[in-house]
């Protein structure tokens, strides 16, 4: 079974797989940054395990994470954002495993929001717009967005469009008439910073018009 020996004997602990992954979010709360880490094995007994980050910090050498159920979390202004930090899983003073990571290479943007779709009758198209908090940020401003849409009845048939702006036009003729569509969007750093896709925005649902029989156009 996973977990380390309660009696202080660390032999068992050293056999466990303590591999973990982390992501950072810069300027997630004003000028505060956050760092979130979690074990890759959900069965690890985390009872006495702690995370610590050292190096590439401002005015301190190390910081301890807060444990929030299954994840470990820091929110701080003290990330230098230059050079690599050493992130370690610890039991007491003993480090079980460590990773050297530059926090600017594991950035996960905040999810886009305010996704909406407006049908333009004259242009026979749909204008997709959404918002992102990153437009106001100092650091991670440039993102690549992934807009995914599908006909609601097609469970896994998503169409993806990559774009750098927050506006997309979908041509009416590319969509099925009189159909319900689901659309969502996510973001990833695209300039200077590296990292991961954000969470998906909440989905938006829209219906395409029926075909107008006389003209072959959708209503």
């Amino acid at each position: 079974e996973s977990g380390y020996a309660q009696n202080g004997d660390l032999e068992d602990a050293e056999l466990d797989d303590y591999s973990f992954s982390c992501y950072s979010q810069l300027e997630v709360n004003g000028s505060q940054h956050s760092l979130t880490c979690a074990f890759e094995d959900p069965d690890v007994n985390i009872t006495n395990l702690e995370f610590e980050i050292c190096g590439a910090l401002v005015e301190v050498k190390c910081l301890n994470f807060r444990k929030l159920q299954e994840i470990y979390f820091i929110e701080t202004k003290k990330f230098l954002l230059i050079g690599k930090s050493n992130i370690c899983v610890k039991v007491g003073e003993k480090s079980l495993t460590c990773k050297k990571i530059d926090l600017t290479t594991i950035v996960k943007p905040e999810a886009p929001f305010d996704l909406s779709v407006v049908y333009r009758e004259g242009a026979n198209d749909f204008v997709v717009t959404f918002n992102t908090s990153h437009l106001q940020k100092k650091y991670v401003k440039v993102l690549m967005h992934d807009v995914a849409y599908r006909q609601e009845k097609d469970e896994n048939k998503w169409t993806h469009v990559n774009l750098s702006s927050t506006k997309l036009t979908l041509l009416q003729r590319k969509l099925q008439p009189a159909a319900m569509y689901e659309i969502k969007v996510r973001s990833i750093p695209d300039h200077y910073f590296k990292g991961f896709w954000s969470e998906w925005s909440p989905s938006y649902y829209f219906r395409t018009p029926e075909i107008n029989n006389s003209s072959g156009e959708m209503d």
């Epitope: 050498k61 230098l80 690599k84 530059d102």
Partner: antibody, heavy 117, light 111 residues
Framework: EVQLVESGGGLVKPGGSLRLSCAAS????????MHWVRQAPGKGLEWVSL????????YYADSVKGRFTISRDNAKNSLYLQMNSLRAEDTAVYYC??????????WGQGTLVTVSS | NFMLTQPHSVSESPGKTVTISCTRS????????VQWYQQRPGSSPTTVIY?????PSGVPDRFSGSIDSSSNSASLTISGLKTEDEADYYC?????????FGGGTKLTVLQ
């Protein structure tokens, strides 16, 4: 084997410009924070500037701010220092240094910049 | 902004132990890591200690680093002095994104 080779130094008149280069090899350049550090003749080490792995973050010592510009070309494994409005007090050996997992793991051999009329 | 102050020079005989201090003028010495560099005459600096007390591979264990909060200083100790240890030694720490170097200490190994 890690190598950092500086070039571009020389004699220049006050008010003039020079561009220093540092060719890097033997390590993952685009993963490393890079610094310029200088040493005036017979004096100690003085930090000049740094650039993050991607070129986004750049920082300068107050003594060179507004006159010097650090940059990098990861495709060419090269670090640069554009020095404008040079002064006599900028005379020094200029070293490029790789931070890697800690500062100063590797230093170049240095290039001498002499500012004199 | 803080300064790092080192003795201008120290000297000791071969085989003995010497300690070079590096005192931070303001703020805590504990608030950022200290590195030590050796610079032999006519050569580039090389790292002998990083992150307060860590030795890069290839640096002999005669070199050790430590931090003393009570004196707000870092120290580099070299035991079993050898003639090849004669060099300038610099401490270095961080002031936010800026690097701060001590003024350097000339170590003379007496013959």
């Amino acid at each position: 084997e890690v190598q950092l080779v500086e070039s571009g130094g020389g004699l220049v008149k006050p008010g003039g410009s020079l561009r220093l280069s540092c060719a890097a090899s033997g390590f993952t350049f685009d993963d490393s924070v890079m610094h310029w550090v200088r040493q005036a003749p017979g004096k100690g080490l003085e930090w000049v500037s740094l650039v993050g792995w991607d070129g986004f973050f750049t920082y300068y010592a107050d003594s060179v701010k507004g006159r010097f510009t650090i940059s990098r070309d990861n495709a060419k494994n090269s670090l640069y220092l554009q020095m404008n409005s040079l002064r006599a007090e900028d005379t020094a050996v200029y070293y490029c240094a790789r931070q890697g997992d800690y500062m100063g793991n590797n230093w170049g051999q240095g290039t001498l910049v002499t500012v004199s009329s | 902004n803080f300064m790092l102050t080192q003795p201008h020079s120290v000297s000791e005989s071969p085989g003995k132990t010497v300690t070079i201090s590096c005192t931070r003028s303001s703020g805590s010495i504990d608030s950022s890591y200290v590195q030590w560099y050796q610079q032999r005459p006519g050569s580039s600096p090389t790292t002998v200690i990083y992150e307060d007390d860590q030795r890069p591979s290839g640096v002999p264990d005669r070199f050790s680093g430590s931090i003393d909060s009570s004196s707000n200083s870092a120290s580099l100790t070299i035991s079993g002095l050898k003639t090849e240890d004669e060099a300038d030694y610099y401490c270095q720490s961080y002031d936010f994104h800026h690097l701060v170097f001590g003024g350097g200490t000339k170590l003379t190994v007496l013959q």
